[in-house]
């Protein structure tokens, strides 16, 4: 879902799933501000104090990142200009499952959207004949 209206910007997320032990993506898009230095992207996880990831003023700010995500997150910095706020999550763990919030702030306003991230062994098993 997303929030829109005066002083709010529309943020869109998509429920997704991650394979344990592989890299996953939590998808989030928004209408990008041309002033990239004014864009703040924050990823939060329900039940976790601290941030999953923060990107502002054109670079990562991981000073408030929760330790369970340390070294495992990245945004697509070169894609922020086209409204891609998606989060890359490395080495997905079972405990990464849950409700995440993608929060965006620009010079025009702010908005957020939630997504449910499921984790598990979703890859098709190999069948040897």
């Amino acid at each position: 879902f997303g929030i829109s209206g005066k002083h709010f910007i529309t943020v869109t997320t998509f429920t997704s799933a991650g394979n344990i032990g592989e890299d996953g993506t939590l998808s989030c898009t928004f209408e990008p501000d041309i002033k990239l230095n004014g864009i703040v992207i924050q990823w939060l996880k329900e039940g976790i104090k601290g941030l999953v990831h923060e990107f502002k003023e054109g670079k990562d700010d991981l000073s408030q990142q929760h330790e369970m995500f340390r070294g495992r997150t990245a945004v697509f910095a070169d894609q922020v200009v086209v409204g891609n706020a998606s989060l890359r999550l490395k080495n997905v763990q079972l405990t990464d499952a849950g409700t995440y919030t993608c929060y965006i702030r620009t010079s025009k306003g702010k908005g957020n959207a939630n997504l449910e991230y499921k984790t598990g062994a979703f890859s098709m098993p190999e069948i040897n004949v």
């Epitope: 041309i34 054109g58 200009v81 086209v82």
Partner: antibody, heavy 116, light 107 residues
Framework: EVQLLESGGGLVQPGGSLRLSCAAS????????MHWVRQAPGKGLEWVAS????????YYADSVKGRFTISRDNSKNTLYLQMNSLRAEDTAVYYC?????????WGQGTTVTVSS | DIQMTQSPSSLSASVGDRVTITCRAS??????LNWYQQKPGKAPKLLIY???IRESGVPSRFSGSGSGTDFTLTISSLQPEDFATYYC?????????FGQGTKLEIK
């Protein structure tokens, strides 16, 4: 083929008006921000104005603020630049460009000459 | 406003030479820098975006580097078709600003 095609340039007297158009084809126009950039004869590139994909963000260079208006019609895949109170220093080739990771697609340009 | 200063303004070189053009921003722009090539009478062409990522279809002899305030465009081995004017451009904030250009001429 991804393409931008400008039109609407010409000779105009100081104080006059022109409306430039930029017709987009070969890509989903409504998904991209757009820019106008100009180049005076023998000079470098100068950014003029930008508009985001849904027109939520619009910005102008100080040199054209209050005189030029950027707009878009996503249903027609067209970008516009309304230029009023034109001055001699507005004489230039005007390019529209797609806002991606860099201005990755440019039109061929349309020439605006402001002279009495 | 963020000023973009390119050096040199012009450069004479020969086919096969390695050439480096520098671009300096008046304040930090992270990695939000593009490089363009323009030939006379033609529209600019995007070469490098986000300081170091080569645009699709651009030959590998073109490379970009840098972050913060100092950036470089390198052409590893000049080809005849590379003689043109090169511009850097920041897209960190408005007004979007270009360098004054570097004209690369045949020696």
């Amino acid at each position: 083929e991804v393409q931008l095609l400008e039109s609407g340039g010409g000779l105009v007297q100081p104080g006059g008006s022109l409306r430039l158009s930029c017709a987009a084809s070969g890509f989903t126009f409504s998904s991209y921000g757009m820019h106008w950039v100009r180049q005076a004869p023998g000079k470098g590139l100068e950014w003029v104005a930008s508009i985001s994909s849904s027109s939520g963000y619009i910005y102008y260079a100080d040199s054209v603020k209050g005189r030029f208006t950027i707009s878009r019609d996503n249903s027609k895949n067209t970008l516009y630049l309304q230029m009023n109170s034109l001055r001699a220093e507005d004489t230039a080739v005007y390019y529209c460009a797609r806002a991606s990771s860099g201005m990755d697609v440019w039109g061929q340009g349309t020439t605006v000459t402001v002279s009495s | 406003d963020i000023q973009m200063t390119q050096s040199p303004s012009s450069l004479s070189a020969s086919v096969g030479d390695r050439v480096t053009i520098t671009c300096r921003a008046s304040q930090s722009i992270s990695s939000y820098l593009n490089w363009y090539q323009q030939k006379p009478g033609k529209a600019p062409k995007l070469l490098i975006y986000a300081a170091s990522i080569r645009e699709s279809g651009v030959p590998s002899r073109f490379s970009g580097s840098g972050s913060g305030t100092d950036f470089t465009l390198t052409i590893s081995s000049l080809q005849p078709e590379d003689f043109a004017t090169y511009y850097c451009q920041q897209y960190y904030t408005t007004p979007l600003t270009f360098g004054q250009g570097t004209k690369l001429e045949i020696k």
